[in-house]
């Protein structure tokens, strides 16, 4: 494949990265799946600046992002690392609040309206983003 | 106060379309997501469909689904359902409600309401 | 479609009972079930979202709890305008289903 240079139609470029903002809403895994088939995946926020430029974009609206702890701690999608990352969370959470019965706690971090992080139950029909980087090597052929 | 007011309900035969409207008053009608639940004679609640506040986004029960379209517009306060090809089972009392939020967040508040008979 | 349950499905109380409603969801819902007051004739009124959060307005004798797949809606002392019958509600995710009520009458 060939290193993407720019961003695909309808996608907005920012420091390097390529954003797609749905406007429809999804369960986490559908969201995640969505990105995965567009070759990219649920955004990684990693500094103040891009959380300012995300949240911008996304509005008042609850917006899944690609954090979760399914399967234990807390991971981003990407592999960047999550304990010496950037994190937003509102007051008191995560709270993986186990309340709920589903088998496991809150498991998916998504924004909220002010743009701070909550950790929820992953079949919320939540506004997605996603991202990808403009560095890195496309799954499309190169044109000729 | 908060209030929503629903009209268009008349007796119609099977196969035809109504068009159900609901005016809002006493909030910011584009902060908030709409719904509608429908009524059978003598039977208990069934969520008809949402629509987002800003239309963004809409779904529907499967039993409407195809027939049934619900819209807004956010510049006269109004939501509205238009009704295809209904059916006998359609016959119900129609409610708009507002959603706690954008759109997934449940009900809050309730209109009183207004009946639809499919009937040949 | 999750689908949603309510036992029992009629009651037979007094003023000044306690009444326990039970609604049940066929998968975990987490916190996101309301309950609703509908009389005869009438628009239905929410009394309960988010399973416990009371609704401004509504008096403090009722109060709900649970998560996950099991909730129940209490009213602390029957009074003669809380006879209706009383629906839950998940909204987790669309379609928002309801339980099929419970009717609360004179004993």
């Known amino acids: 494949g060939s290193e993407r240079t720019c961003c695909p139609v309808n996608w907005v470029e920012h420091e390097r990265s390529c954003y797609w903002f749905s406007r429809s809403g999804k369960a986490w895994a559908d969201a995640d799946n969505y990105c995965r088939l567009e070759d990219a995946h649920l955004v990684v926020v990693t500094s103040w600046e891009e959380q300012k430029f995300v949240q911008h974009h996304i509005g008042p609206v609850n917006t899944w992002m690609g954090l979760h702890d399914q399967n234990g701690p807390w991971k981003w999608v990407d592999g960047t690392d999550y304990e010496t990352g950037f994190k937003n969370w509102r007051p008191e959470q995560p709270d993986d609040w186990y309340g709920h019965g589903l088998g496991g706690g809150e498991d998916c971090a998504h924004f909220t309206d002010d743009g701070r992080w909550n950790d929820d139950v992953c079949q919320r029909p939540y506004r997605w983003v996603c991202e990808t980087e403009l560095d890195k090597a496309s799954q499309e052929p190169p044109l000729l | 106060q908060v209030q929503l007011v629903e009209s268009g309900g008349g007796v119609v035969q099977p196969g035809r379309s109504l068009r159900l409207s609901c005016a809002s008053s006493?909030?910011?009608?584009?902060?908030?997501?709409m719904h509608w639940v429908r009524q059978a004679p003598g039977k208990g609640l069934k969520w008809v469909a949402v629509?987002?506040?800003?239309?963004?986004?809409?779904y529907y029960a499967d039993s409407v689904k195809g027939r049934f379209t619900i819209s807004r517009d956010n510049s006269k306060n109004t939501l509205s359902l238009q009704m295809n090809s209904l059916r006998a089972e359609d016959t119900a009392v129609y409610y708009c409600a507002r959603d706690r939020s954008v759109g997934y967040d449940g009900l809050d508040v309730w209109g009183q309401g207004t009946t639809v008979t499919v009937s040949s | 479609d999750i689908q949603m349950t309510q036992s029992p499905s009629s009651l037979s109380a007094s003023v000044g009972d306690r009444v326990t409603i039970t609604c049940r969801a066929s998968?975990?819902?987490?916190?996101?079930l309301a309950w609703f007051q509908q009389k005869p004739g009438k628009a239905p009124k929410s009394l309960i979202y988010?399973?416990?959060s009371l609704q401004s307005g509504v008096p403090s004798k009722f109060s709900g709890s649970g998560s996950g797949t099991d909730f129940t809606l209490t009213i602390s002392s029957l009074q003669p305008d809380d006879f209706a019958t009383y629906y839950c509600?998940?909204?987790?995710?669309?379609?928002?289903?309801f339980g099929p009520g419970t009717k609360v009458d004179f004993k």
């Open positions: 629509i987002w506040f800003d239309g963004s986004n809409d």
């Open positions: 006493g909030f910011t009608f584009r902060n908030y997501g």
């Open positions: 988010a399973a416990s």
């Open positions: 509600q998940r909204y987790d995710t669309y379609p928002f289903t």
């Open positions: 998968q975990g819902i987490g916190k996101y």
